[in-house]
């Protein structure tokens, strides 16, 4: 017996006192467990276990399937074991044909022997096919044959356990190895749309696609900052051996404003995790928000072009768009298009192209857009800059010289006197009276300015220049003086 300290419990003793025993098929298996605190015998082989509360285990007619480990346990939980082989020439192998191997791990082909004294216990390929060159294995008569470091390439490999019995090769039933791939990368996750905008009461449905090498990838939909379990439905497919796809669809049948938020599709495997998010915004009703891309007050020079551009957000999608000027709707000269081709796009662009604008075409240009819930508009005030035009230049009966000019921005009129016939006038003359004639008129278009000077101040022959100018340009008109004695004979206005 093993040496033990006095009073220290020792394991039971089994008779016959061998680690391993061979019994011929049909013979009796008789095993005796000696221990003052005997509790039970247990028998294990493959996935089978049996128990016996008698201290003598007796199997009257041994069968190959009685091959296995017999363990006697005492009340202290100490145990001793004997492994019994039931030698049956007709059944050399016990087999559990389920064979799964995890990639890069060892896996056991469960074909324990009923006779440990056979030779050449090994693996063979089915139908005489050779095993993969890199396949290494370790035989153990009591357990089976361990395949070392399973490769993905071994998937669906057909195998037999083999042994030589009395000079003849004996094969077990066939095994088909199913390889469970190792996760060597995080799952690939994608979402049907990155963002959703819905009105209250509409259905929210979003699908997450998870791709990995096997179905043991874990996935779930989570609401950010919430522990609530979300209802999801799954569909899955195996596209070949190591190409698994799962679609997890999250649905809220009638969305509410407080359902708004970020939803995360999370997936993980033993290598790591990956996630993708989608944003849900639920609004109580639709909206339109317009953003001018240029200043709403526009100044443009006469004859030039201008583009009035707006971007707008519209949900639900816009149904009617129009550009209006002076109560007239443009039928052409404008275009409206989505900002992106993205399915969830709610941003649009509208452009009105005004070409070769005339001074008379200033005014308010209005963009109107509507959807099923709301209308919205934005106005652009367009001012056409025009070079001053001298409308009239006269000598009035009271001796005043008067010049009337129109333009935008409002022209300034300056007066100059030129002695003789010189038309380069430098000496300025202060006007007697200046008036803006249509300041209270329509807000767009040309502004008319009238300026007057007293001609009696001129004592010599010469020319008076009326010069009207603004930011755009300048225009002049001239009055010629000729004196005869003390009388002013002629005043000839000309431009």
């Amino acid at each position: 017996q093993p040496s033990v300290s006095p009073g220290e419990p020792s394991p039971p003793s089994i008779h016959p006192a061998k680690s391993e025993l061979i019994v011929r098929v049909g013979n009796e298996i008789r095993l005796l467990c000696i221990d003052p605190g005997f509790v039970k015998w247990t028998f294990e082989i493959l996935d089978e276990t049996n128990e016996n509360k008698q201290n003598e285990w007796i199997t009257e007619k041994a069968e190959a399937t009685n091959t296995g480990k017999y363990t006697c346990t005492n009340k202290h939980g100490l145990s001793s074991s004997i492994y019994v082989f039931v030698r049956d020439p007709a059944k050399l192998f016990l087999v559990d044909r389920s064979l799964y191997g995890k990639e890069d791990n060892d896996t056991l082909v469960r074909c324990p022997l009923t006779d440990p004294e056979v030779t050449s216990y090994s693996l063979k390929g089915c139908q005489g096919k050779p095993l993969p060159k890199d396949l290494r294995f370790v035989p153990d008569p009591k357990a089976g044959i361990t395949i070392k470091s399973v490769k993905r390439a071994y998937h669906r490999l057909c195998l037999h356990c083999s042994a030589d019995q009395e000079g003849k090769s004996v094969l077990s039933d066939k095994f088909i190895l199913k390889v469970r791939p190792a996760f060597k990368a995080v799952p690939v996750v994608s979402v049907s749309k990155a963002s959703y905008l819905l009105r209250e009461g509409e259905e929210f449905t979003v699908t997450c696609t998870i791709k990995d090498v096997s179905s043991s990838v874990y996935s779930t939909w989570k609401r950010e900052n919430s522990q609530t379990k979300l209802q999801e439905k799954y569909n899955s497919w195996h596209h070949g051996d190591f190409n698994y796809e799962r679609q997890a669809t999250l649905t809220i049948s009638s969305a509410r404003v407080n359902d708004s938020g970020v939803f995360m599709c999370y997936a993980n495997n033993t290598f790591g995790s990956a996630n993708v998010t989608t944003t849900l915004e639920v609004v109580d009703k639709g909206f339109i928000n317009i953003f001018p891309m240029i200043n709403t007050t526009v100044f443009v020079n006469d004859g030039e072009n201008v583009d009035l551009i707006v971007e707008y957000e519209a949900f639900p999608k816009p149904e009617h768009q129009q550009w209006i000027y002076m109560n007239r709707t443009f039928t052409d000269k404008w275009e409206d298009y989505p900002k992106s081709e993205n399915e969830s796009n709610i941003r649009y662009v509208s452009e009105l192209h005004l070409t070769r604008l005339k001074g008379t075409e200033g005014g308010t240009y209005t963009f109107l857009v509507s959807n099923s819930d709301v209308n919205a508009s934005i106005a652009f005030n367009v001012y056409v800059n025009t070079k001053p035009e001298i409308l009239t230049y006269d000598r009035l009966v009271n001796g005043m010289l008067q010049c009337v000019a129109a333009g935008f921005p409002e022209p300034t009129i300056d007066w100059y006197f030129c002695p003789g016939t010189e038309q380069r006038c430098s000496a300025s003359v202060l006007p007697v009276d200046v008036q803006t004639l249509n300041a209270s008129g329509p807000p767009f278009g040309k502004l008319v300015v009238q300026s007057s000077i007293d001609s009696s101040a001129f004592k010599h022959n010469g020319t008076v220049e009326c010069k009207a100018y603004n930011d755009v340009g300048k225009t002049s008109a001239y009055f010629n003086f000729a004196f005869k004695g003390n009388n002013k004979e002629q005043i000839h206005p000309h431009t």
């Epitope: 391993e20 019994v23 008789r30």
Partner: antibody, heavy 121, light 107 residues
């Protein structure tokens, strides 16, 4: 060649001690459970005791007639089995055989030629 | 201890005879029984193990049978080299006791 060779026998006085050795060759000694069997002159065979291998935790078992006086030991590195005999009695006079058990059964499939131990005053 | 009783203790037979030796155990020993042959001045030799399994190299005229408590060794046709003493031994529970032996002599 597979064989067992006993040595160390001889004449010893009652109460004396003797150590028998058994040298093994030709097989993996460390895997084997080993026994001592004796045969008194003109008598039948009597099992003396045994020692298990490492798998059997080197457990030893003895016949009641020798328990407490005889000790079986082994040295796997030297492929040797020993029988230490103390407090020898005249009835211990016998040829002592060293025997090997096969792996999967308790029987004695290989025997040495034996060594004679005579206990006499 | 388990007692092993062999009978007869001796027998006389001629070459070619069928010889039967019996062995009885004091309690059931299943098939844990072995038979040995010993010639004068020699070490015993294993003939039969596990009641009926013939040891490698042993002539097939030797056979064993029985289970539980009663066992038989049969020599189907006695040969000159078979004159010897035969022992049974139980290997169920230590001490592994031997029978008293059966001496087979020439008639």
């Amino acid at each position: 060649e597979v064989q067992l060779v006993e040595s160390g026998g001889g004449l010893v006085q009652p109460g004396g001690s003797l150590r028998l050795s058994c040298a093994a060759s030709g097989f993996t000694f460390s895997d084997a459970d080993m026994d001592w069997v004796r045969q008194a002159p003109g008598k039948g065979l009597e099992w003396v005791g045994r020692t298990r291998n490492k798998a059997g935790s080197y457990t030893t078992e003895y016949a009641a007639s020798v328990k407490g006086r005889f000790t079986i030991s082994r040295d796997d590195s030297k492929n040797s089995l020993y029988l230490q005999m103390n407090s020898l009695k005249t009835e211990d006079t016998a040829v002592y055989y060293c025997a090997r058990e096969p792996k999967y059964w308790i029987d004695f499939d290989l025997w040495g030629r034996g060594t004679l131990v005579t206990v006499s005053s | 201890d388990i007692q092993m009783t062999q009978s007869p203790s001796s027998l006389s037979a001629s070459v070619g005879d069928r010889v039967t030796i019996t062995c009885r155990a004091s309690q059931s020993i299943s098939s844990y029984l072995n038979w040995y042959q010993q010639k004068p001045g020699k070490a015993p030799k294993l003939l039969i193990y596990a009641a009926s399994s013939l040891q490698s190299g042993v002539p097939s005229r030797f056979s064993g049978s029985g289970s539980g408590t009663d066992f038989t060794l049969t020599i189907s046709s006695l040969q000159p080299e078979d004159f010897a003493t035969y022992y049974c031994q139980q290997s169920y529970i230590a001490p592994y006791t031997f029978g008293g032996g059966t001496k087979v002599e020439i008639k």
